[in-house]
């Protein structure tokens, strides 16, 4: 009876989930009901006495195939070369931190932190980003000056839409400048780096939205938002890139208890965006110009735009008052890069299709870890590589471009049987000379099979050993690109392979 009831519940719950999808219920509600369905199915499995274990990766995670890894490494290479070009050092930190280290740093996002089950010792959490661990590292080592990059996985208990390149385990590529410097110079460099990387990756047209936490706070103050509601109203404003002003206003008034007239005043500001002229216009604003914080923020943005013009990237930057990045630790300039979808109608503005990089100034974060509250000014950026991987992968799929998943330069093959020893000797010579080489793991492989593997793997060269060639002291070298085949003296083979693959002299 129990089993029949469970089966009926699984059927009913399945129908319930389908109904919710048809009604276009909220993603969270659907997710919750799907989770319930899976729990019911799991109980059915246990009831059978042998639970059907479904082989899959945990929710919000994925494996990377060799093809995907090849894409990923190319993306990382572009990013790392840029970071190094700007003089950054590299660090690494543990994947988990003391829970206390992460507590109180992320505002409303704190609920997304993964806590590890207490093993009777320290209370631990998986890192949520690379910025808070960096601040902890600075405070712990009493560092006041560093320019560093850090590429590593972070963890968020989000309800991700994996199709849009969002995950629970994902890479972040961070670049940060810590230290007391003249205003806006490091900030401008961060924006320059962001633009360099996004341009190099050739993933499409992008725009970097810029704002300042002080302008936001000043704006909220002059609009009449109570201090206690600043952060929560911030998170509502930040949704303006995804939903209409009406929906944001309804959330502010209906859910967050803001007076409608206060919300309207906010609306007058946050729907504005432009360049340095908007900064100047707001400096003349009768209300904002009376707010010390807002004036400081606007003054810094004016200076920032001067540097951005010198860096030649001002055309990529937009001052956007609706940008209100949701992390509690930002104190000054904040920025976010979005990919632009070109307008379908002439005269329309380009449409933002999701954040691909972001960052800002966080002058107070290190002080949170310092016993004396000593501050280390910091500014940084984070590249949203998972989104970028998705875009690059989609583009490659659409173009049907072949992606090489190995760096093998030459396949060592044999034309006749009983030449395994010769192949092993030759491949070893090549490895010792720093050449990337492979052979098939068969004693007597058919030449056709070897050549087929060579072509499919996209290996540029094949070195073919034959009995006659052995007697003559030569190796046949065939190129996949030109299809030409030449006899190369054995002692010249390494040099010839290097020449053909443009590889500098190197040994392992």
């Amino acid at each position: 009876a129990d089993r029949a009831a469970l089966e009926e519940l699984v059927r009913l719950q399945g129908a319930h989930v389908r109904g919710l999808k048809e009604q276009k219920a909220s993603a969270e509600q659907i997710e919750e009901e799907v989770t319930k369905l899976l729990k019911l199915k799991a109980q059915l499995g246990q009831d059978e006495g042998k639970q059907k274990f479904v082989l899959k990766t945990p929710k919000g995670t994925r494996d990377y195939s060799p093809r995907q890894m090849a894409v990923r490494e190319k993306v990382f290479d572009v990013i790392i070369r840029c970071f190094k070009r700007h003089g950054a050092e590299v660090i690494d930190t543990p994947v988990f931190e003391l829970k206390e280290t992460l507590t109180g740093k992320y505002g409303e996002d704190s609920k997304l932190i993964y806590d590890l089950k207490d093993q009777g010792g320290e209370l631990l959490s998986l890192r949520y980003d690379l910025t808070v661990p960096f601040a902890r590292y600075l405070a712990m080592n009493k560092l006041t000056n560093i320019k560093r990059y850090h590429i590593a996985k972070v963890y968020r208990r989000d309800n991700p839409a994996m199709t849009r390149g969002r995950y629970r385990e994902f890479y972040q590529c961070d670049f940060d400048i810590a230290g007391q410097f003249d205003p806006m110079i490091p900030d401008a460099e961060c924006l320059k780096i962001m633009c360099e990387i996004l341009s190099s990756l050739q993933i499409g047209n992008f725009l970097v939205k810029v704002n300042d936490r002080r302008i936001l706070d000043g704006m909220f103050a002059v609009c009449g938002v109570p201090d206690s509601k600043f952060r929560t109203i911030c998170s509502s404003v930040d949704k303006l890139d995804k939903v209409s002003w009406e929906e944001v206003k309804n959330e502010m008034v209906g859910e967050k208890g803001l007076a409608p007239e206060v919300a309207d005043r906010i609306g007058d500001y946050v729907q504005q965006h432009g360049g340095v002229s908007l900064v100047e216009q707001l400096l003349q604003d009768p209300k904002l110009s009376q707010n010390k914080q807002a004036v400081e923020g606007l003054g810094d943005l004016k200076l920032l735009f001067e540097y951005l013009i010198l860096f030649g990237i001002d055309d990529k930057i937009s001052f956007d008052l609706s940008l209100a990045r949701g992390l509690d630790y930002y104190t000054g300039v904040i920025y976010e890069a979005v990919l632009l979808q070109m307008p379908t109608q002439a005269g329309e503005e380009p449409l933002g299709v999701g954040s691909i990089a972001a960052g800002g100034r966080y002058d107070g974060l290190v002080g949170m870890f310092d016993p004396k509250g000593r501050k280390v000014p910091c500014v940084g950026l984070s590249i949203g590589v998972e989104r970028i991987f998705s875009i690059v992968e989609q583009r490659l799929e659409a173009s049907e471009e072949k992606v090489r998943t190995t760096e093998t330069q030459v396949l060592v093959a044999s034309a006749q049987k009983k030449l395994l020893e010769e192949r092993l000797k030759l491949v070893s010579e090549l490895w010792d000379a720093g050449i990337k080489a492979e052979l098939l793991y068969k004693k007597n492989p058919k030449l056709l099979n070897q050549l087929q593997y060579w072509e499919e793997a996209g290996i540029p060269l094949v070195a073919i050993i034959g009995e006659q060639e052995l007697r003559d002291g030569v190796i046949k070298l065939r190129s996949v690109a030109s299809r030409e085949e030449v006899d190369v003296r054995r002692e010249d083979l390494v040099e010839e392979i290097r020449r053909r693959t443009n590889q500098p002299l190197s040994t392992c």
Partner: antibody
Framework: QVQLVESGGGLVKPGGSLRLSCAAS????????MSWIRQAPGKGLEWVSY????????NYTDSVRGRFTISRDNAKNSLYLQMNSLRAEDTAVYYC?????????????WGQGTLVTVSS | DIQMTQSPSSVSASVGDRVTITCRAS??????LAWFQQKPGKAPKLLIY???NLESGVPSRFSGSGSGTDFTLTISSLQPEDFATYYC?????????FGQGTKLEIK
């Protein structure tokens, strides 16, 4: 056998706060959605709030949203209801209840209830 | 919110009688309906879930039927211990709501 024992009820003035607790035993607490259901004296039943097995999902009836907070500690096999800004209409017996088949919103096991009286 | 309406609000019957209580939902709830029995000073006790499934340990004289918006609880032959208040509850969508109750009294 399944046992749910509520505590923390009592007399409180309007605007005051109380924290109800529910100690669970006899089943794998961390597998089950849990809920608080109340019953005003001489009245019907009202489903106040629920929380999922790992606290990912919570929900509240409109009359308590923003004032009450449901939470759980799976390590301690305990369910909690933090009640703030209490009103006279919150006076009721509060029952802690376990979901049927872990996730079905039907209470198959109930505690004995704890009385909350809000009065000046 | 889904409203649940029970009828009658009270019923008098004798031991051995067949009793039917009905419950109507303000909108379709498929089979997401449960029935509870409550005695004075006690917590409710689950009798029926998903409209017709008998909770283990509940006597077979209790049965449930219906789907969509109309549901019934039937006690085929009343026993002395069955005199109590009966509630229906929808488990289709939050807030999960109960009927106002049907008091079953001895005639």
């Amino acid at each position: 056998q399944v046992q749910l024992v509520e505590s923390g009820g009592g007399l409180v003035k309007p605007g005051g706060s109380l924290r109800l607790s529910c100690a669970a035993s006899g089943f794998t607490f961390s597998d089950y959605y849990m809920s608080w259901i109340r019953q005003a004296p001489g009245k019907g039943l009202e489903w106040v709030s629920y929380i999922s097995d790992s606290s990912t999902y919570t929900n509240y009836t409109d009359s308590v949203r923003g004032r009450f907070t449901i939470s759980r500690d799976n390590a301690k096999n305990s369910l909690y209801l933090q009640m703030n800004s209490l009103r006279a209409e919150d006076t009721a017996v509060y029952y802690c209840a376990r979901y049927l088949y872990q996730v079905i919103a039907v209470a198959d096991s109930w505690g004995q209830g704890t009385l909350v009286t809000v009065s000046s | 919110d889904i409203q649940m309406t029970q009828s009658p609000s009270s019923v008098s019957a004798s031991v051995g009688d067949r009793v039917t209580i009905t419950c109507r939902a303000s909108q379709g709830i498929s089979s997401w309906l449960a029935w509870f029995q409550q005695k004075p000073g006690k917590a409710p006790k689950l009798l029926i879930y998903v409209a017709s499934n008998l909770e283990s340990g509940v006597p077979s004289r209790f049965s449930g039927s219906g789907s969509g918006t109309d549901f019934t609880l039937t006690i085929s032959s009343l026993q002395p211990e069955d005199f109590a208040t009966y509630y229906c509850q929808q488990a289709n969508s939050f807030p999960y709501t109960f009927g106002q109750g049907t008091k079953l009294e001895i005639k």
